[in-house]
């Protein structure tokens, strides 16, 4: 089976305050089994943005139907962006277990927030 890649094709995304930001993430293999999670930042201080298995995440919607078994697109849209949302977002694959363990991360996408147009 193909080795899993977590593809975040965008190095950076710039969005005006109040708009929505789309952060792209695709995977190349359905294995290992386990959920995708999105975080802002890295290390112990990282913030969970979206978890395929939990919720709700009121400002976050998935671009594709992530509940479909064959889905490989885990892109998300974050609504009503504010300056506090700026940072680097990582799409991370977890391996199913008790508890789930982090398996592989995407390269990250830096979100910058522009002032709302006057």
């Amino acid at each position: 089976e193909e080795e899993l890649q977590i593809i975040q094709p965008d190095k950076s995304v710039s969005v005006a305050a109040g708009e929505s930001a789309i952060l792209h993430c695709t995977i190349t293999s359905l294995f290992p089994v386990g959920p995708i999670q999105w975080f802002r930042g890295a290390g112990p201080a990282r913030v969970l943005i979206y978890n395929q298995r939990q919720g709700p995440f009121p400002r976050v919607t998935t671009v594709s139907e992530t509940t479909k078994r064959e889905n490989m697109d885990f892109s998300i849209s974050i609504s009503n962006i504010t300056p506090a949302d700026a940072g680097t977002y990582y799409c991370i694959k977890f391996r199913k277990g008790s508890p789930d363990t982090e398996f592989k991360s995407g390269a990250g996408t830096e979100l910058s927030v522009r002032a709302k147009p006057s």
Epitope: Q8, D10, K11, T26
Partner: antibody, heavy 125, light 105 residues
Framework: AVTLDESGGGLQTPGGALSLVCKAS????????MGWVRQAPGKGLEWVAG????????NYGPAVKGRATISRDNGQSTVRLQLNNPRAEDSGTYFC??????????????????WGHGTEVIVSS | ALTQPASVSANPGETVKITCSGG????YGWYQQKSPGSAPVTLI????KRPSDIPSRFSGSTSGSTNTFTITGVQAEDEAVYYC???????????FGAGTTLTVL
Amino acid sequence: AVTLDESGGGLQTPGGALSLVCKASGFTFSSYAMGWVRQAPGKGLEWVAGIDDDGSTANYGPAVKGRATISRDNGQSTVRLQLNNPRAEDSGTYFCAKASVTGWSAHISGRLDTWGHGTEVIVSS
Amino acid sequence: ALTQPASVSANPGETVKITCSGGGIYYYGWYQQKSPGSAPVTLIYENDKRPSDIPSRFSGSTSGSTNTFTITGVQAEDEAVYYCGGYDSNTTSGIFGAGTTLTVL
């Protein structure tokens, strides 16, 4: 207007080192990823190498991986491709191309918005 | 590898569609080359974006991992080779399709 001017082509000796330079103008060079694409005589386009806006990541096509190095000088608005141990199959026209975004370097071959006119490389003894 | 048809043909005024698959979901581009060795021209980048100087008869759209390039109302001057570009997860690098030759009858 955005312009990309390639130089450094011509007759090259097998086993030496090939160095191509692309000089960019008309845009904020440091804000965009750049790439090199080549075309052998009678063949299609082939991805050679890409580099993101700040030079932190580079990506190489399978035919040149391990022999090629792409680099950039944001102060001089240039991107350079060095190809070690060139062989006859490296002959062709080399195009410099600007991406529409900052990077990542592996993901810009579908995001090229401007091309140079190309420089012809002939590898022969 | 990116898969695209080797050739297509159409009469002036007809609509031409060329598909490209195998490059994942994000991102595809379409490049026109009128003669070998001449500089390609970008018609579509990032799946569906068109440079400001490109006529609106050229468009791109994506469904799943297949991108479709469309010329609505093909003209004689559109006769060329069209290449799609994308990402190859096998080599983890950029890649181009083999090219599609458009003949305007």
